[in-house]
C-alpha cells in the first residue's frame, strides 16, 4: 500500500482510495473555478506517463500564493516517492511548454480519471 | 512592490522586426524565471517564452520557435524578446511576467502590430 497519511485520514490510505480523493480535489478545483485559476499562472506542462505524479507537483509546487491548488499539491506529493522542492526538476520532466494552471488540471483530470477507470492506483 | 514595465511594441510590416525590453523592479530579478506571454484580441493567454535565471535555460512555443529570442541583463533588470520575421498572426499585447505568479506579477503590456 501507498502511504499516504497525514493529509487525509490517520493511517496508510489504499491507493484506489488516494487516488479517487486527487480525483475529487481536482474537480472540485475545476466547479468552482470563478476567476482565472491562481491569477492565470502558467506552469510547465508534462508528460503523462511514467513519474506523472512527481512531475505533476514539480510543476504546480513553482506556483505560490494559491490556496486553489494547495491541496493538490499536499496530495500529489504522497503520490512521488522522493521530496520535491520549488525550481527542481528531473530528468523526466521535460520543459518544453507552459500552459495555465486551470488546463493544466484539466488535463490531469483527464488523465486520473481514465486511469481509474482502468483500475492503475499505482 | 513587484513592477514590470514592457516597451518596444508598435506596428510593423510582415517580415519586420522589433525588441521589446521589460524593466524589473521590486525584487531580485537575477533569481527568478520569467516568461513572455501575448494575447492577441479576441484571444485567450498564449505563453512565448521563458529564460531561467542565469539566462542559460530558454525555451520557446512551437509557433515562435527560430524567429522570437528571449534574453536578460541580471546587472540592469531587464528581460528582452527579440522578435524577427514578423507574421500578422503575432499581432497581440505582449506581457512580461515573473513567472508562476500569475497576473500579480505581470506588465501592462506593450501592443505588437503586425500588418501591411
Known amino acids: 500500500l501507498t502511504c499516504l497519511g497525514g493529509f487525509a485520514s490517520p493511517g496508510p490510505v489504499p491507493p484506489s482510495t488516494a487516488l479517487r480523493e486527487l480525483i475529487e480535489e481536482l474537480v472540485n478545483i475545476t466547479q468552482n473555478q470563478k476567476a482565472p485559476l491562481c491569477n492565470g499562472s502558467m506552469v510547465w506542462s508534462i508528460n503523462l506517463t511514467a513519474g506523472m505524479y512527481c512531475a505533476a507537483l514539480e510543476s504546480l509546487i513553482n506556483v505560490s500564493g494559491c490556496s486553489a491548488i494547495e491541496k493538490t499539491q499536499r496530495m500529489l506529493s504522497g503520490f512521488c516517492p522522493h521530496k520535491v522542492s520549488a525550481g527542481q526538476f528531473s530528468s523526466l520532466h521535460v520543459r518544453d511548454t507552459k500552459i495555465e494552471v486551470a488546463q493544466f488540471v484539466k488535463d490531469l483530470l483527464l488523465h486520473l480519471k481514465k486511469l481509474f477507470r482502468e483500475g492503475q492506483f499505482n | 512592490e513587484v513592477q514590470l514595465l514592457e516597451s518596444g511594441g508598435g506596428l510593423v510590416q510582415p517580415g519586420g522586426s522589433l525588441r521589446l525590453s521589460c524593466a524589473a523592479s521590486?525584487?531580485?530579478?537575477?533569481?527568478?524565471?520569467m516568461d513572455w506571454i501575448r494575447q492577441a484580441p479576441g484571444k485567450g493567454l498564449e505563453w512565448v517564452s521563458s529564460i531561467g535565471p542565469s539566462g542559460s535555460f530558454t525555451r520557446y512555443a512551437d509557433s515562435v520557435k527560430g524567429r522570437f529570442t528571449i534574453s536578460r541583463d541580471n546587472s540592469k533588470n531587464t528581460l528582452y524578446l527579440q522578435m524577427n520575421s514578423l507574421r500578422a498572426e503575432d499581432t497581440a499585447v505582449y506581457y512580461c511576467a515573473k513567472a508562476y505568479t500569475g497576473f500579480r506579477y505581470w506588465g501592462q503590456g506593450t501592443l505588437v502590430t503586425v500588418s501591411s
Open positions: 521590486g525584487f531580485t530579478f537575477r533569481d527568478y524565471e
